[in-house]
């Protein structure tokens, strides 16, 4: 069977029909559908005007306007709010009724297509083996990235989100829409990875999606993510106004003229260097979301009772901090170098900046504990990657399923850990799950390109597929059309299990607490260790103080601070402008190297970005507890510049007050309403509260945006704020 | 000018078929979309579907699906609507109506034919 | 099917006044119409796309509204405007509210 040409609100669409086999199987492809207008920079999306006659649907559209890999030039386009569909049909009657899945694809929200890098003529985000193998209809798209997706003034002049906006047209074009292809419009799951995890996440949290979500799933990226939300989003507008040519002493005319200017030149003024970086890369990621008033109400850790009936599936990867650790720390995919206590007290304390001196150690001390034991330098390095696996990935999503069990109602709630090893060959060979190893066997690629992948890389595709495909049909990613290798349990407070996905799975594959202790750490130890002021010294390693960091700014100066010179071991400074700054990592559909053996570019789509409020506490042992969130707006400062602004500034030591109390016991206190800048922050209501959804405040057109505190422009961000 | 023209009133039997037809002239007629509303006595409207006239290609309302075929004749800038297995429930008056333009709303209107279906 | 609902279903006034009539989409859509319907006549657009004014309407009539929520405003109410009035919504399958019988009072 076939669909032919589908009505759908624009006007009529055709697509390809492609026979599978001898059985008669097919399926149906539509590619470049419009879901909006072409937009406008810097303007929210507005629904298309439509055709008449029948639009061809059969290639990709042009992704969003962004940088190339090198930085030095753009591709993509303006026009770009287009979307693709995967409809499997059988012998007879057209399908109807199916699951349909939309896929939102990662890329620091900064890069990336719907379609993803293309090798041996099959792109990465291709829906064919998801739609066949699952019996679902996938639906990918793009959304606009970097500055044109996310740059804001911090208020109404430039409210931004404009790329998430992009990302909720999609999901309600589909639920209006997908009932004509022979999906059920009551039963859309959002999946996604890295950035594009997050923003499922995201999506889930915002009202402007009521009703329009059944189930999600997280790969890589949630909400909670400390590189998701942007703080102080001024800061880096007014460092892309100034590298155009804009005025940057009215915020109003500062966006008008940002809204005329050339969009490729905006999207050029920033860029993301990426060596010889003073501080950890996701300082450097400035244009992501932000909290807006409106389609993101509030702090993501509040808005937990939105995603109250939604199923939710989320994971990680087991070394997704890898490319980052490799990025900020060179040597660690070096056989001949070796990591030193001294560069990694360095990065522990430049991730840990709000706590002071006892922060970096503390943390140092905790993750260098086997150290003594197995001096290794595997095992050094594997702890490097440890640590930025915790901190950018799996505390924040073991807090965001905390969360979201707390809060769900009759939805159920999912947790697994990517564990098959990635397949690069440059790699050591203790390297695990990498960031965005996950996508190729979710996507089929051992199927679609069997070429260098073997069969137990296709087990681990097809148990994938199984259970997301199932959970897609009914919320239950054991049950379904899809056979699977072993009982997923769901993930409780009390048990905080999770799936172990690797290439041999059994009863043991179900496993409990992941990384308990460093969780625990995160959650209680960490987040009660006072906070500094901006006046007190920053860490200093423990041989010496040879590489001190430069101190951080302490009042309203718009210059950065000075970095140590001489031979005091410092760092050197990031690269500015145009001087020729290597390349962004590679990111899933850039079609750069390094490639797997699988070409499918499974390099990670999503470097982590900025600073995304402090995660709320996980429960910790068997307390059943609730995990209770911070809440306060803790105002965190902006992050560094990465023009031609000189060097970027030392984050600050923070001033948001007492750290949040972690849950203790069985207290069984009201929750606190926040209350502005109290000096404790406030609990807000977790578990089975009944709290109504959060509204959005104001109208979408003139979004009210939280006020941005300018005197706060030359510091960096905290990036660590559990 | 845009005119539709559509053909005379029809009484019918239950179970029979009724087929009426709507003439276009006045602009390029396969360029835009032609659809099919109806309106029973003292009732209000509702979309039964739509036709490409540039290729044919249909789309009918769930409700309608397996009772109505909509077709075109470019050679006379005609579109057809026939409606089977008539019951008495279909008296009503059936309107082509022609989109504004993209996939805006409906702009132009045939002055309507009614179909009684009584026994 | 996205379900449409009109308020009032019927409602009395006098040429001058300002009317106001509300349509409410069951979910969020993009695309919103107002047509006026005189008895034994065919529809008539009077606004598209929510808010644009067909051609040789006059600009008495406005309309407002995005999402689920959606007005159509006759600012001074002559003769010729007692009809009944009808939202519509364009997705793929586009359905009408039940209709406004504006009448004189």
């Known amino acids: 069977a076939k669909l032919g040409a589908v009505y759908t609100e624009g006007g009529f669409v055709e697509g390809v029909n492609k026979k599978l086999g001898l059985l008669g199987d097919s399926v149906d492809i539509f590619k470049g559908i419009p879901f909006a207008a072409p937009t406008k920079a810097l303007e929210n999306p507005q629904p298309h005007p439509g055709w008449q006659g029948t639009l061809k649907a059969k290639n990709f559209k042009k992704r969003c306007l962004q940088a190339t890999i090198t930085q030095d030039s753009t591709y993509g386009d303006e026009d770009c709010l287009y979307l693709n569909i995967w409809v499997p049909q059988g012998r007879k009657q057209v399908s109807r009724d199916l699951p349909v899945m939309i896929w939102i694809y990662g890329g620091a929200f900064l890069m990336g297509s719907g379609h993803g890098a293309n090798f041996l003529n099959n792109y990465l985000y291709d829906g064919e083996e998801i739609a066949t193998r699952g019996n679902v209809i996938v639906v990918t798209f793009n959304y606009r990235v970097g500055p044109l997706g996310f740059l804001s003034t911090g208020d109404a002049n430039l409210p931004g989100n404009y790329g998430l906006r992009d990302q909720h047209m999609a999901i309600a074009w589909v639920k209006r829409n997908i009932a004509a292809f022979g999906g059920d419009p009551n039963n859309i799951t959002l999946f996604g990875e890295s950035a594009g995890g997050a923003s499922v996440s995201l999506q889930t949290l915002s009202p402007y999606n009521k009703g329009l979500i059944r189930r999600a799933i997280s790969q890589s990226g949630v909400a909670l993510s400390p590189w998701v939300i942007q703080k102080n989003p001024l800061f880096w507008a007014k460092k892309v106004a100034e590298k155009v040519g804009c005025p940057v002493g009215d915020a109003a005319r500062m966006a008008q003229c940002l809204k005329v200017t050339d969009p490729r030149a905006l999207t050029l003024a920033y860029k993301v260097p990426l060596a010889g970086l003073e501080y950890p890369m996701l300082h450097y990621v400035g244009f992501v979301p932000v909290i807006d008033g409106d389609f993101i109400p509030a702090d993501p850790i509040n808005l937990y009772a939105n995603a109250a009936d939604i199923d939710y599936i989320a994971g990680t990867n087991n070394m997704d901090g890898h490319i980052f650790a490799s990025i900020d720390m060179p040597a660690i995919n070096k056989g001949n170098k070796k990591v030193t206590e001294e560069d990694f007290y360095k990065l522990v304390s430049e991730f840990t900046i709000t706590k002071g001196l006892r922060g970096a150690k503390t943390t140092f001390d905790v993750y260098t504990e086997s150290w003594a034991q197995d001096p290794s330098q595997e095992n050094k390095k594997k702890t490097v990657v440890d640590f930025e696996t915790d901190v950018l990935f799996l505390v924040p999503t073991e807090i965001a399923l905390a969360q979201h069990r707390a809060n769900a109602k009759s939805a159920k709630t999912y947790a697994y850990l990517f564990s098959h090893p990635s397949r690069m060959p440059v790699y050591p060979k203790w390297v695990g799950a990498d960031h965005a190893d996950d996508i190729q066997y979710v996507f089929g690629k051992p199927f679609a390109t069997p070429t260098g992948y073997r069969p137990q890389d296709r087990t681990v595709s097809k148990a994938m597929i199984a259970y997301w495909t199932n959970f897609a049909k009914t919320g239950d990613p054991n049950m379904g059309d899809s056979a699977v290798p072993t009982h997923w349990e769901p993930y409780t407070t009390e048990n905080s299990g999770y799936l172990e996905i690797t290439k041999k799975m059994g009863s043991s594959s179900m496993k409990r607490s992941l990384r308990t202790n460093f969780l625990r750490y995160w959650t209680l130890t960490y987040l009660a260790l006072p906070t500094v002021t901006d006046q007190e010294a920053t860490p200093v390693p423990p041989t010496g103080d040879s590489e001190a960091t430069p101190v951080p700014p302490t009042g309203d100066s718009e210059t950065a601070p000075v970095p140590p010179t001489g031979d005091s071991g410092a760092p050197p400074v990031p690269p500015t402008g145009d001087s020729g700054a290597p390349p962004v990592p590679p990111t899933g559909d850039s079609g750069a190297p390094p490639v797997p053996p699988t070409g499918d570019s499974g390099a990670p789509p999503v470097p982590p970005t900025g600073d995304s409020g402090a995660p709320p506490v996980p429960p910790t042992g068997d307390s059943g507890a609730p995990p209770v969130p911070p809440t306060g707006d803790s105002g965190a400062p902006p992050v560094p510049p990465t023009g031609d602004a000189g060097p970027p500034p030392v984050p600050p030591t923070g001033d948001s007050g007492a750290p949040p109390v972690p849950p203790t016991g069985d207290s069984g206190a009201p929750p606190v309403t926040p209350t502005g800048d109290s000096e404790t922050a406030p609990v807000p209501p977790t578990g089975d509260s009944g709290a109504p959804p959060v509204p959005p405040t104001g109208d979408s057109e003139a979004a009210p945006v939280p006020p941005t505190d300018d005197s706060k422009e030359a510091q960096m961000p905290a990036v660590i704020r559990f | 000018q845009v005119q539709l023209v559509q053909s005379g009133a029809e009484v019918k039997k239950p179970g029979a078929s009724v087929k009426v037809s709507c003439k276009a002239s006045?602009?390029?007629?396969?360029?835009?979309?032609m659809h099919w509303v109806r309106q029973a006595p003292g009732q209000g409207l509702e979309w039964m579907g739509v036709i490409n006239p540039g290729d044919g290609a249909t789309s009918y309302n769930q409700k309608f699906q397996g009772r109505v075929t909509m077709t075109r004749d470019t050679s006379t800038s005609t579109v057809y609507m026939e409606l089977s297995s008539l019951r008495s429930e279909d008296t009503a008056v059936y309107y082509c109506a022609r989109d504004y333009y993209g996939s805006s709303p409906l702009g132009y209107w045939g002055q309507g034919t009614l179909v009684t279906v009584s026994s | 099917d996205i379900q449409m609902t009109q308020s009032p279903s019927s409602l009395s006034a006098s040429v001058g006044d300002r009317v106001t009539i509300t349509c409410r989409a069951s979910s969020s859509i993009s695309y919103l119409n107002w047509y006026q319907q005189k008895p034994g006549k065919a529809p008539k657009l009077l606004i598209y796309?929510?808010?644009s004014l067909a051609s040789g309407v006059p600009s008495r009539f406005s309309g407002s509204g995005s999402g689920t929520d959606f007005t159509l405003t006759i600012s001074s109410l002559q003769p010729e405007d007692f009809a009944t009035y009808y939202c519509h919504q364009r997705s793929s399958s586009p359905t009408f509210g039940q209709g406004t019988k504006l009448e004189i009072k």
């Open positions: 006045g602009y390029t007629f396969t360029s835009y979309n």
């Open positions: 796309a929510a808010s």
